[in-house]
Amino acid sequence: CKAMHVAQPAVVLASSRGIASFVCEYASPGKATEVRVTVLRQADSQVTEVCAATYMMGNELTFLDDSICTGTSSGNQVNLTIQGLRAMDTGLYICKVELMYPPPYYLGIGNGTQIYVIDPEPCPDSDF
């Protein structure tokens, strides 16, 4: 039974280029050396994994090459950036943190960040 406290902002507005950034912060009960961070998207009763990364404390956060996420870590704080977002991707993005090693295993789920994405208006044709 190990539900850590995980904090994340309630609302974030993506940039016109479809990029959204937010901080996911967790209160570690122990001295974890290996941490796994997962971003989940919840729509109604469906939960899908957006991206995930495992990192060693003090090292950089590494997502897979084809991931839409990038991030950096500092202590018990992870700065997450999701790119390539479109209006249809507007929704609740949940930060899940797992302390993988050493035991004991701890898990925490944030309340979610509502990311709003507005597709940019197409540029009007120029008459030249």
Partner: antibody, heavy 115, light 108 residues
Framework: EVKLDETGGGLVQPGRPLKLSCVAS????????MNWVRQSPEKGLEWVAQ??????????YYSDSVKGRFTISRDDSKSSVYLQMNNLRVEDMGIYYC??????WGQGTSVTVSS | DIQMTQSPASLSASVGETVTITCGAS??????LNWYQQKQGKSPQLLIY???NLADGMSSRFSGSGSGRQYSLKISSLHPDDAATYYC??????????FGGGTKLEIK
């Protein structure tokens, strides 16, 4: 080697108190949230109580069935966790396990409530 | 409170077979689920944590999967030693951290 040794179980009359103790070794006790879980043939495994550690201000949580009657406590200097059970009922009978996180389990101590 | 429904309550299978045990939560639990193995007369042992991660010292024939509200434990190439009762448990706050009712596995 990880060890959790529960003691204090036994036969007790309904309405009477009983205190269980658990001594841990082989892991960093202060990093663990400690729990008591009980098991009976009627109810299977049932989580009873949890006490978190210093970074979480030793917060305590209880199942509804024991709230107000049971108290969980810990002594990090002795790597020990306790369960004070008051006003025991017949339905509290079972094997009580002490767990470190949920990763480590003791061998259990049996509690029988009968007049 | 979130309820955990485990099925089947019991099953019997032969050595070498593959079996699957399922656990359903009454609400989304985001993979916050553990599986335990309890052999006759012994304490439960952590088998799978966080829905998919195999606990130290456990055979790789055990695997966990699932998301949202539905989770499963798969045991491949059954051994006689796998005879036990298996429990799932929700480890998501708030409490209680409820267990499923258990699945008793008998090896023929």
């Amino acid at each position: 080697e990880v060890k959790l040794d529960e003691t204090g179980g036994g036969l007790v009359q309904p309405g009477r108190p009983l205190k269980l103790s658990c001594v841990a070794s082989g892991f960093t006790f202060s990093d663990n949230w400690m729990n008591w879980v009980r098991q009976s043939p009627e109810k299977g495994l049932e989580w009873v109580a949890q006490i978190r550690n210093k970074p979480y201000n030793y917060e305590t949580y209880y199942s509804d069935s024991v709230k107000g009657r049971f108290t969980i406590s810990r002594d990090d200097s002795k790597s020990s966790v306790y369960l004070q059970m008051n006003n025991l009922r017949v339905e509290d009978m079972g094997i009580y396990y002490c767990t470190g996180g949920m990763d480590y389990w003791g061998q259990g101590t049996s509690v029988t409530v009968s007049s | 409170d979130i309820q955990m429904t485990q099925s089947p309550a019991s099953l019997s299978a032969s050595v070498g077979e593959t079996v699957t045990i399922t656990c359903g939560a009454s609400e989304i639990i985001y993979g916050a689920l553990n599986w335990y193995q309890q052999k006759q007369g012994k304490s439960p042992q952590l088998l799978i944590y966080g829905a998919t991660n195999l606990a130290d010292g456990m055979s790789s024939r055990f695997s966990g999967s699932g998301s949202g509200r539905q989770y499963s434990l798969k045991i491949s190439s059954l051994h006689p030693d796998d005879a036990a009762t298996y429990y799932c448990q929700k480890i998501l706050s708030p409490p209680p951290w409820t267990f499923g009712g258990g699945t008793k596995l008998e090896i023929k």
